[in-house]
């Protein structure tokens, strides 16, 4: 029977800069029941606080609700593992909420084949930003990527779309069914998961080349 091994805070994420969650990996338990607590203070302060919510984020997590989240302050946190034989502490982790945002996937992905009379046909892809993100405040710049592939193809092709919420693709294989997905990230954060795939059947008379 031993003191617990050193835990590690391995990830912190925020969906929208208004709340965030951090997760830790326990070290070895030393063969004894082990309690974990996360403590933190804000940069420039000495007062230590304990994690306000160990439930919302699941096992080995700490969730910071709106009233505990501030964009303009760096959080310095550590996890303490304790059993009957002693304690061990994780390394301190410095967290700036601005840099840990991972939004939900974009919404309302719509894909359509456009066949104008006077121009070459194209695939028109359109989507909306995730609902949790408030783009009107200017705090957020969301960037988007699209990926698509024929249903039976092994590799996706990925396109960076900048801040635009629509994208055109020419030159597709006629008669094939394509899968299309979109994802987003804030300018300083992490890519969201890909949205659910939308399927589109390319007509057999689609002009292949431009």
């Amino acid at each position: 029977q031993l003191p617990p091994g050193k835990p590690e805070i391995f990830k912190c994420r925020s969906p929208n800069k208004e709340t965030f969650t951090c997760w830790w990996r326990p070290g070895t338990d030393g063969g004894l029941p082990t309690n974990y607590s996360l403590t933190y203070h804000r940069e420039g302060e000495t007062l230590m606080h304990e994690c306000p919510d160990y439930i919302t984020g699941g096992p080995n997590s700490c969730h910071f609700g709106k009233q505990y989240t501030s964009m303009w302050r760096t959080y310095i946190m550590m996890v303490n593992a304790t059993n009957q034989m002693g304690s061990s502490f994780s390394d301190e982790l410095y967290v700036d909420v601005t840099y840990i945002v991972q939004p939900d996937p974009p919404l309302e992905l719509a894909v359509e084949v456009k066949q104008p009379e006077d121009r070459k046909p194209y695939l028109w892809i359109k989507w909306s930003p995730p609902t949790l993100i408030d783009l009107k405040t200017g705090w957020f710049t969301l960037l988007y990527e699209i990926r698509l592939k024929p249903e039976k193809a092994a590799e996706w092709e990925i396109h960076f779309a900048g801040q635009q919420t629509e994208f055109k693709i020419l030159s597709l294989h006629p008669g094939q069914k394509y899968l299309v997905q979109v994802r987003c990230k804030p300018d300083h954060g992490y890519w969201s998961a890909w949205s659910p795939a939308t399927f589109i059947q390319i007509p057999s008379d689609f002009t292949m080349n431009d």
Epitope: I158, F160, Q163, F167, K168
Partner: antibody
Amino acid sequence: EVQLLESGGGLVQPGGSLRLSCAASGFTFSSYWWHWVRQAPGKGLEWVSDISSLSSYTGYADSVKGRFTISRDNSKNTLYLQMNSLRAEDTAVYYCARGLDARRMDYWGQGTLVTVTS
Amino acid sequence: QSVLTQPPSASGTPGQRVTISCTGSSSNIGYGYVVHWYQQLPGTAPKLLIYRNNWRPSGVPDRFSGSKSGTSASLAISGLRSEDEADYYCAAWDDSLNGWLFGGGTKLTVL
């Protein structure tokens, strides 16, 4: 017929400024992404900047970030590159290029030479 | 540092098949971003030759073809002609740079 004509290049001293223009005709200018790409004498191509069709997104190579500004005037069918704090290593032929789907550069201008020397 | 690596030179005789490689990394070609190829004839502006890995713009002969696998892409030119003598560049978006990357270019000589 697609036509792209760059202008505004010339000789400038280090620390100086230039504004390049790219006048486009023969298609709907506002529907496309636009790029600036440069080529130093005897060297390869280097991407400089791009701007999205709705002007909402602008991107820059690290080597020019904070010194160059890309912009567009859809009413004049013209792309611009404002170059400030120019350095000797900015000496190159500057090309404008139209960005189609996947932002591939499907048409290029003939280029304008920028020479930065004291 | 993100780079696309091309051989500086390649050569072949008329009628031969020549392949030019473009090797990237997990932040560009390996990430899934598409590869474009440009041809620059001496003293002229670059011209789009292959786009989105393997598509040919109208007007480009079918002697030119592109492919992509993993972190690399290739341009193949079959039935080599003297007018193919040019510099060839690959290009791909790079996620870590948030910008376009060009390969260093390959000078093709037709012997």
